[in-house]
Interface confidence: low
C-alpha cells in the first residue's frame, strides 16, 4: 500500500487552530521516479456533504512529500469529507476523513467501519440531543433507510447492512428529519473485496494475518498498519509518537500523537495514533490495553508489563505477544518482515534461529508460496545463534507471496512468514527524446515510460555514432534530470538508447528502442573578456572569464585559455572543456615568470574571438641560485660545470637542472638533472666539437629555484660531431684531481 | 417484555418434513438479524441457519444445507425453519435466538442476546 | 472451517472456588468476536460475555473474559450455588459464521 497519512488535528475549541496535514512517506515522493509524478493534493471534498461556503482554505507545501490545510473560521467549515491523493500512476491513493460536528444532534459511535465482504455492517448513531422525529439514513448522499424514533436501542439508532459488498463502501449518514445536514452524524464504510482473510483476483489468496490491528489490503495481500506498528504483518511497535510504514514520521508537537486522528488508505480507514482513544483521541488507553484506538488488550503473562504504545514488554527469558513464550523455544530472529527480488535471479535468503537446544542446519526450512520447501546449503553456528543459507532457484514472478522460514527442535518450534517480492526489470517502452543538439553534445530527456517494475535506480544512455560497428559509449545518469552526451563529433548522427536498472542484483533491464539524434555546428561568435585572476602558488594561477549575456542558447563547446611566455617565446593552451565554466585553475607554471593570458570560446574546431588580453606576474620561488657557476672545457666533446650550493637554503636540496644551448642557436635549450645534491661538478659529455655553449643551472628542493648566472665556454676543435650532450657527475675535488 | 416462543417441534419418520415457527415479541422483529441452534440430548450447541433482517440474505450449517430453508415474515414477526428429509440426527432441541450488536472500544460485538425457550423435534421410526 | 475446543470438559469445584474455562480455536477469531453462555438443565442459553471480555447486561461481576486470536479464556473469581451449569464458547464471522465449542460442565465437588 501507498505510505500515505492524512492527520487531523482534533483541537476542536477553536476551529481556527485546526489542521489538516496530508504526509507521504513514498521513496523518492516527489524525487527521483516520482519527480514528474502529481503532487499531493488535500482538499474538501464537497460532493456529498455540503457546508455553506466560506473563505478558502489555506494549502501549505512543506516540500514534496507534506501538505497542510488550514483557515477554518467557523466550526461547520470542519465537517464534512476531506481527502488527500497521492503516489503515482497506478499507486495513486486516495486516503479519507470525515470530520462529525462535536455539537450534533446524532453521533457516530465509530466512524470508520472496516468489513468484509458478505459481512453484516452494523452503523449506530448515539442520540446527543434527541428529536422525536423520524432518522433518515443516507449512502453517498442518496436516500436509503428510515427509523422510527421509537427503535432507538440503548440511546442510538442503528443500520444494519446484511452480506455487504464493495458497491456498499462510502459515506453513510443519519440525520433527524427537520434537522441540519451538519447535526448528522457521518459515518465512512469499507468493504473489501473479499471475504475475512482473504485476498486476490477471486479472492483466493490467504491474507498473512495482519497483528495489531492491521488490515489485510484485498489487492494486493499486503497489511495496512496502524499508525505506530509496522512490518509485513504490522508485527513490530514504532517509538512513541512515530507513524508511517517505516516509523520515519513523528507527531507534531510536544504531546506526541495526543489529539490526532490518522488516516490510512482503504481498507484500514481512520484511527487515533497508538496509545490513545476517544472521539478526539485525547484519552490514553486505560491500563492492560494499547494500540491504535486502545483496541488490543496485552494479557501479558510471565512478569511481562504493558506498555500503551506497543503492548506487552517482556522480562529477560521470555518473548512473544504476551510473553507466552519461552526463550527455551527456538526462536527465528531477525527476519526480515519483506524481501525484494528481481526476476530471474538467485538470490541466497539467510535465516538465522537461536533455542535451546541449538538448532543445527538440518533444523530450519525455508517454505515457498507453492509449498515447495528448501533446505540450507550451508549453516553459519555462532554462539547465540545458527544462520541458515537457502539458494533460491531461479526466480519466477509466482514466487511472489508470503515465505516462511521455520525452525523444529525437540524444545518446539518457531516460524516466521515473510514477503517475498519479485519484480521484473524495467524496458524503456519508447526512445530518449532529444531537448537541445550542439556541435559536439547533445542533450537528452533520459525519462520513457516503461514496463517492469520501478523505481528506476539507474538509467544507462547507450550511444554510438550511426552506422558504427564500434563499442556503444555508455553514460549513467540521474533519471530525474537530463543529460547531456559530450565529446561527440560535430555533424554526426548518433545512434542512443536507454537501458534502465531498478534496486538490486539482476536488476537491469533490457535495452529501449534506439533513436537518432545529430550533432550541430554553428560558429562561435561572443568574445569573453577576463574578470580578473589571482595567484594560487608559484606555479598556480585562478583565472575567472564572463560572456556578454544575449538571448538564446550559448553556441560553444568550452574555452581556450592561451598564455605567452614572452622571455621564453612560448605558448601554453589550457582547453575548459565546459561552456557553463567561468572559471579556471591553471597548474604547472614557470614561477617568477611574465605571462600575457587570454581567453576565447570555441565551438567544434572554430575558435571565437579572443578577449582582450592580461598580463600577469607570477611570484619566483624555490631555493636561491646556485653560486660562482664556472664551465671549463676538457676536450672536443667535454665541458665541466663547477659551482658552490646556493646558500640560506630552507631545506635539502633535491637535485639542479643544468640548461644547455648552443649560443645563438634557435633550438629549444636541453635540461640535465644532476641527481646527487651534494655535488659541485659535473661534466657534460657529448658536445659537439668547436661549439660555443651557454649553460644555467638551478636547486630543486620542493620547486624549481631561481637559475644561477648565464656561463659561456667553448668545446675545444678537432673532434666529430657528437650525438648530444650528456652529464657525468663526481666530487668538484676529485674532478680537480684527474 | 422481549421474547421469542418456538414452536411446530414433535415426532416424525425419517425422511418425513417439519415446519418450525418462531414467535418475537417486545422489539422491532424487522431489524435483527435472527438464527436457530440446535442441541442434540446431551450434546452441545450445533448453530444450524441465520437470516438477516430483510429476508434476502440466508446461511446454513453444511450437515442442514439442501435439506433445511430459514424464512421469516417481517409483517407477523415471526421466523420459519423448514425441515425436510430428516434423518434420525436432527433430532434435537431447536432453539431460536436474536443478534444483537453490542459496541466496545474495539467495535461491533454480536451476540445472542434473547433465547426461545426451545422446541424438541424427534426424528425416529 | 474454524473448530472450537474447550477444556476441560468438566470442572468439579466448590462455592467460593475459581473457576478458569479454556477455550481455543483452530484458527485466528476475527476481531475478538466470542462469546461467552451459560446454560442451565431444561434452559435455553444465557449470554454472560461478548467481543471476549465485555460482560452482558446483568451478569454479575465475577464473571470475567479474556484472550484474543486463539485462545480465550473465562473465569468466575467466586462460585456461587447459581454458577454450576454448562458453558459455552461461540465464535462469530468466521466459517462457517458461528461456531459452538463443545462446552464445560462446571459441577459440585
Known amino acids: 500500500a501507498v505510505d500515505l497519512t492524512l492527520l487531523a488535528n482534533l483541537r476542536l475549541t477553536d476551529p481556527q487552530r485546526f489542521f489538516l496535514t496530508c504526509v507521504s512517506g513514498e521513496a523518492g515522493a516527489g524525487r527521483g521516479s516520482d519527480a514528474w509524478g502529481p503532487p499531493l493534493l488535500l482538499e474538501k471534498d464537497d460532493r456529498i456533504v455540503r457546508t455553506p461556503p466560506g473563505p478558502p482554505l489555506r494549502l501549505a507545501r512543506n516540500g514534496s512529500h507534506q501538505v497542510t490545510l488550514r483557515g477554518f473560521s467557523k466550526p461547520s467549515d470542519l465537517v464534512g469529507v476531506f481527502s488527500c491523493v497521492g503516489g503515482a500512476g497506478a499507486r495513486r491513493t486516495r486516503v479519507i476523513y470525515v470530520h462529525n460536528s462535536p455539537g450534533a444532534h446524532l453521533l457516530p459511535d465509530k466512524v470508520t467501519h472496516t468489513v468484509n465482504k458478505g459481512d453484516t455492517a452494523v452503523l449506530s448513531a448515539r442520540v446527543h440531543k434527541e428529536k422525536q422525529t423520524d432518522v433518515i439514513w443516507k449512502s453517498n448522499g442518496s436516500y436509503f433507510y428510515t427509523l422510527d424514533w421509537h427503535e432507538a436501542q440503548d440511546g442510538r439508532f442503528l443500520l444494519q447492512l446484511p452480506n455487504v459488498q464493495p458497491p456498499s463502501s462510502g459515506i453513510y449518514s443519519a440525520t433527524y428529519l427537520e434537522a441540519s445536514p451538519l447535526g448528522s452524524a457521518f459515518f465512512r464504510l469499507i468493504v473489501r473485496g473479499c471475504g475475512a482473510g482473504r485476498w486476490g483476483p477471486g479472492c483466493t489468496k490467504e491474507c498473512p494475518g495482519c497483528l495489531h490491528g492491521g488490515v489485510c489490503h484485498d489487492h494486493d495481500g499486503e497489511c495496512v498498519c496502524p499508525p505506530g506498528f509496522t512490518g509485513t504483518r504490522c508485527e513490530q511497535a514504532c517509538r512513541e509518537g512515530r507513524f508511517g510504514q517505516s516509523c520515519q514520521e513523528q507527531c507534531p508537537g510536544i504531546s506526541g500523537c495526543r489529539g490526532l486522528t490518522f488516516c490510512l488508505p482503504d481498507p484500514y480507514g481512520c484511527s487515533c495514533g497508538s496509545g490513545w482513544r476517544g472521539s478526539q483521541c485525547q484519552e490514553a488507553c486505560a491500563p492492560g490495553h494499547f494500540g491504535a484506538d486502545c483496541r488490543l488488550q496485552c494479557q501479558c503473562q510471565n512478569g511481562g508489563t504493558c506498555d500503551r504504545f506497543s503492548g506487552c514488554v517482556c522480562p529477560s527469558g521470555w518473548h512473544g505477544v504476551h510473553c507466552e513464550k519461552s526463550d527455551r523455544i527456538p526462536q527465528i530472529l531477525n527476519m526480515a518482515s519483506e524481501l525484494e527480488f528481481n526476476l530471474e535471479t538467485m538470490p541466497r535468503i539467510n535465516c538465522a534461529a537461536a533455542g535451546n537446544p541449538f538448532p543445527v542446519r538440518g533444523s530450519i526450512e525455508l517454505r515457498k508460496p507453492d509449498g515447495t520447501v528448501l533446505l540450507s546449503t550451508k549453516a553459519i553456528v555462532e554462539p547465540e545463534k545458527t544462520t541458515a543459507e537457502f539458494e533460491v532457484p531461479r526466480l519466477v514472478l509466482a514466487d511472489s507471496g508470503f515465505w516462511e522460514c521455520r525452525v523444529s527442535t525437540s524444545g518446539g518450534q518457531d516460524s516466521r512468514r515473510f514477503k517475498v517480492n519479485v519484480k521484473v526489470p524495467p524496458v524503456p517502452l519508447a526512445a530518449p527524446r532529444l531537448l537541445t543538439k550542439q556541435s559536439r553534445q547533445l542533450v537528452v530527456s533520459p525519462l520513457v515510460s516503461f514496463s517492469g517494475d520501478g523505481p528506476i535506480s539507474t538509467v544507462r544512455l547507450h550511444y554510438r555514432p550511426q552506422d558504427s560497428t564500434m563499442d556503444w559509449s555508455t553514460i549513467v545518469v540521474d533519471p530525474s534530470e537530463n543529460v547531456t552526451l559530450m565529446n561527440l563529433r560535430p555533424k554526426t548522427g548518433y545512434s542512443v538508447r536507454v537501458q534502465l536498472s531498478r534496486p538490486g542484483e539482476g536488476g537491469e533491464g533490457a535495452w529501449g528502442p534506439p533513436t537518432l539524434m545529430t550533432t550541430d555546428c554553428p560558429e562561435p561568435l561572443l568574445q569573453p573578456w577576463l574578470e580578473g585572476w589571482h595567484v594560487e602558488g608559484t606555479d598556480r594561477l585562478r583565472v575567472s572569464w564572463s560572456l556578454p549575456l544575449v538571448p538564446g542558447p550559448l553556441v560553444g563547446d568550452g574555452f581556450l585559455l592561451r598564455l605567452w611566455d614572452g622571455t621564453r617565446g612560448q605558448e601554453r593552451r589550457e582547453n575548459v572543456s565546459s561552456p557553463q565554466a567561468r572559471t579556471a585553475l591553471l597548474t604547472g607554471l614557470t614561477p617568477g615568470t611574465h605571462y600575457q593570458l587570454d581567453v576565447q570560446l570555441y565551438h567544434c574546431t572554430l575558435l571565437g574571438p579572443a578577449s582582450p588580453p592580461a598580463h600577469v606576474l607570477l611570484p619566483p620561488s624555490g631555493p636561491p641560485a646556485p653560486r660562482h657557476l664556472h664551465a671549463q672545457a676538457l676536450s672536443d666533446s667535454e665541458i665541466q660545470l663547477t659551482w658552490k650550493h646556493p646558500e640560506a637554503l630552507p631545506g635539502p636540496i633535491s637535485k639542479y637542472v643544468v640548461e644547455v644551448q648552443v649560443a645563438g642557436g634557435a633550438g629549444d635549450p636541453l635540461w640535465i638533472d644532476v641527481d646527487r645534491p651534494e655535488e659541485t661538478s659535473t661534466i657534460i659529455r657529448g658536445l659537439n666539437a668547436s661549439t660555443r655553449y651557454l649553460f644555467r643551472m638551478r636547486a630543486s628542493i620542493q620547486g624549481l629555484g631561481d637559475w644561477s648566472n648565464t656561463v659561456e665556454e667553448s668545446t675545444l676543435g678537432n673532434g666529430l660531431q657528437a650525438e648530444g650532450p650528456v652529464q657525468e657527475s663526481r666530487a668538484a675535488e676529485e674532478g680537480l684531481d684527474q | 417484555e422481549v421474547q421469542l416462543l418456538e414452536s411446530g417441534g414433535g415426532l416424525v419418520q425419517p425422511g418425513g418434513s417439519l415446519r418450525l415457527s418462531c414467535a418475537a415479541s417486545?422489539?422491532?422483529?424487522?431489524?435483527?438479524?435472527m438464527i436457530w441452534v440446535r442441541q442434540a440430548p446431551g450434546k452441545g450447541l450445533e448453530w444450524v441457519s441465520r437470516i438477516y433482517p430483510s429476508g434476502g440474505g440466508t446461511e446454513y450449517a453444511d450437515s442442514v444445507k439442501g435439506r433445511f430453508t430459514i424464512s421469516r415474515d417481517n409483517s407477523k414477526n415471526t421466523l420459519y425453519l423448514q425441515m425436510n428429509s430428516l434423518r434420525a440426527e436432527d433430532t434435537a432441541v431447536y432453539y431460536c435466538?436474536?443478534?444483537?450488536?453490542?459496541?466496545?472500544?474495539?467495535?461491533?460485538?454480536?451476540?445472542?442476546?434473547?433465547w426461545g425457550q426451545g422446541t424438541m423435534v424427534t426424528v425416529s421410526s | 472451517d474454524i473448530q472450537m475446543t474447550q477444556s476441560p470438559g468438566t470442572l468439579s469445584l466448590s462455592p467460593g472456588e475459581r473457576a478458569t474455562l479454556s477455550c481455543r480455536a483452530s484458527q485466528s477469531v476475527s476481531g475478538n468476536l466470542l462469546a461467552w453462555y451459560q446454560q442451565k438443565p431444561g434452559q435455553a442459553p444465557r449470554l454472560l460475555i461478548y467481543g471476549a471480555s465485555s460482560r452482558a447486561t446483568g451478569i454479575p461481576d465475577r464473571f470475567s473474559g479474556s484472550g484474543s486470536g486463539t485462545d480465550f479464556t473465562l473465569t468466575i473469581t467466586r462460585l456461587e450455588p447459581e454458577d454450576f451449569a454448562v458453558y459455552f464458547c461461540q465464535q462469530y464471522g468466521g466459517s462457517p459464521p458461528v461456531t459452538f465449542g463443545g462446552g464445560t460442565k462446571v459441577e459440585i465437588k
Open positions: 417486545g422489539f422491532t422483529f424487522s431489524s435483527y438479524l
Open positions: 435466538a436474536r443478534v444483537t450488536y453490542y459496541y466496545d472500544s474495539s467495535g461491533y460485538q454480536p451476540a445472542f442476546d434473547i
